[in-house]
Interface confidence: low
């Protein structure tokens, strides 16, 4: 904007905004003054109210600029001494409208400074967690999932520098995958897709558990809940679909309280669901032990 008789542009990283005092132009209709602030892209504008003393009927409004539409941030009823207003964009405007004489304009003294914009705090995934080094550009967020759940998406997000900083990828989710291979299985958990909610229909999921060399596996049934129809859980004593079953939900009515022991270093877990009915599925805990 081109400065008028009562218009000022500020472009430094900080500065002072003071109410106009000796204006050479006539003020018999009052003042309508604009203060435009523009800081470096990637930064926002922070305005602190150092002092304010307005006469009745005078107005001060603060707006964030640089977005698709002006963003109202504050007006005189909100602008108390010590108040801090932050524009999430790199441009802001302060408008001061005063009364005509004889009252004369009120006074104010504001200080502005640029502040580094940041990424929003990333969503914590259900059944997982996130740790953040910094929300500023260059900072990172690291995600991990609870035992038995797998990360779908980015393990690390980086906050990228931009006019409005953003994470470089979508926040990941933790899912109970339909199968997988778990090498060097020492201790952990496998859960059916959707757990603890219901699994979906027409699944065929295979998990291969492999203990470290020279160790065997103990499998404990934390929860098994299958629909009454043709849904089936089979646990095989080996590393493939041909290995002999040591548990088959078709054959056994009760879960072995003591769990299952592998004869070698593998268990092969199969979950299959049909086209009707659903239940919570299963959660199995495994632990490796020395032979």
């Amino acid at each position: 904007q081109t400065p008028g008789p009562c218009s000022w542009n500020f472009s430094g990283p900080e500065g002072s905004l003071d109410s106009p005092t000796d204006l050479s132009s006539p003020t018999d209709v009052g003042l309508d003054c604009f203060f435009y602030i523009s800081v470096y892209p990637g930064y926002g504008v922070e305005i602190k109210v150092q002092n304010i003393s307005l006469r009745e009927g005078e107005t001060v409004t603060v707006e964030g600029l640089g977005g698709p539409d002006p963003l109202p941030l504050a007006n005189q009823s909100f602008l108390l001494r010590g108040q801090v207003i932050r524009s999430p964009t790199h441009q802001a405007a302060l408008r001061f409208q005063s009364l005509p004489p004889p009252a004369g304009p009120g006074t104010f003294h504001f200080h502005y400074q640029a502040y580094l914009l940041s990424c929003h705090f990333p969503r914590r995934p259900a059944y997982g967690d996130v740790t953040v080094t910094s929300l500023h550009p260059g900072g990172s967020a690291r995600f991990h999932c609870a035992t038995g759940y797998q990360l779908k998406g980015a393990r690390h997000l980086t906050c990228l520098n931009a006019t409005q900083p953003f994470w470089d990828s979508k926040e990941p989710v933790c899912i109970a995958a339909c199968g997988g291979v778990i090498r060097n299985a020492t201790t952990g958990r496998i859960v059916s897709p959707g757990f603890p909610g219901n699994y979906s229909n027409n699944l065929t999921c295979h998990w291969l558990l492999e203990a470290p060399e020279g160790q065997r596996l103990h499998l404990h049934f934390e929860k098994v809940s299958l629909a009454e129809d043709d849904d089936r859980l089979i646990i095989r004593n080996g590393d493939n679909v041909e290995a002999p079953p040591v548990y088959d939900s078709y054959e056994v009515e009760y879960l072995p309280i003591e769990g299952l022991l592998s004869s070698g270093k593998h268990f092969f877990v199969e979950l299959s669901t049909d086209s009707s009915g659903a239940a919570a599925g299963m959660a199995l805990r495994y632990e490796a032990f020395q032979q």
Partner: antibody, heavy 118, light 107 residues
């Protein structure tokens, strides 16, 4: 610099299995997911699945359910993709790709041609 | 799965031309879209991510735009090395899916 070097071309009969390897260098192997993508002749690229090398957890495209297994050997910084019950339509170039940096599939292996023919 | 449809399927142009390729998703993908370039016998190369962000080292004649379901790759002034096949990719939902490709040929 990041490099992904894949194993050589394979010719397989229908019903057989194939295992393709991808050796990574130039970065910390366990810090990034490894994805597998294939491309049949004249066809679009198709995502197969990924593995999280830190714990060996894998996620797959449901299209390949039960036929694909992705594994890693972290000591050798190598990922493997095994596809079983091969059919002629599995004839394709198979790529490994390091994914999820600022850009998905930012680094690619040179590709491995798998031909399924009786 | 989200379907990605590119147009045109093939395109003839000359060096210096401005070229536009479009990609339409079957649902809103929230700008989680990348563009890749692939030359015969080679692996794809990443050009654009997050709909409009240029990958490091990619010439500035490449640009991306769009939101919601409709996205565009523009090459402002074609160079001889730009003749290749271009693919879009959505990664808003799993599984990530690619477009069928647009083959850019020399006129």
């Amino acid at each position: 610099q990041v490099q992904l070097v894949q194993s050589g071309a394979e010719v397989k009969k229908p019903g057989a299995s194939v295992k393709v390897s991808c050796k990574a260098s130039g970065y910390t192997f366990t810090d990034y997911n490894m994805d597998w993508v294939r491309q049949a002749p004249g066809q679009r690229l198709e995502w197969i699945g990924y593995i999280y090398p830190d714990n060996g957890g894998a996620g797959y495209n449901q299209k390949f359910k039960g036929r694909v297994t992705i594994t890693v050997d972290t000591s050798a910084s190598t990922a493997y993709m095994e596809l079983s019950s091969l059919r002629s339509e599995d004839t394709a170039v198979y790529y490994c790709s390091r994914s999820i940096t600022t850009a998905w599939f930012a680094y690619w292996g040179q590709g491995t041609l798998v031909t399924v023919s009786s | 799965d989200i379907q990605m449809t590119q147009s045109p399927s093939s395109l003839s142009a000359s060096v210096g031309d401005r070229v536009t390729i479009t990609c339409k998703a079957s649902q809103d993908i929230n700008s989680y879209l990348s563009w890749f370039q692939q030359k015969p016998g080679k692996a794809p190369k990443s050009l654009i991510y997050r709909a409009n962000r240029l990958v490091d080292g990619v010439p500035s004649r490449f640009s991306g735009s769009g939101s919601g379901t409709d996205y565009t790759l523009t090459i402002s002034s074609l160079q001889p090395e730009d003749f290749a096949t271009y693919y879009c990719l959505q990664y808003d939902e799993f599984p990530p899916t690619f477009g069928q490709g647009t083959k850019l040929e020399i006129k």
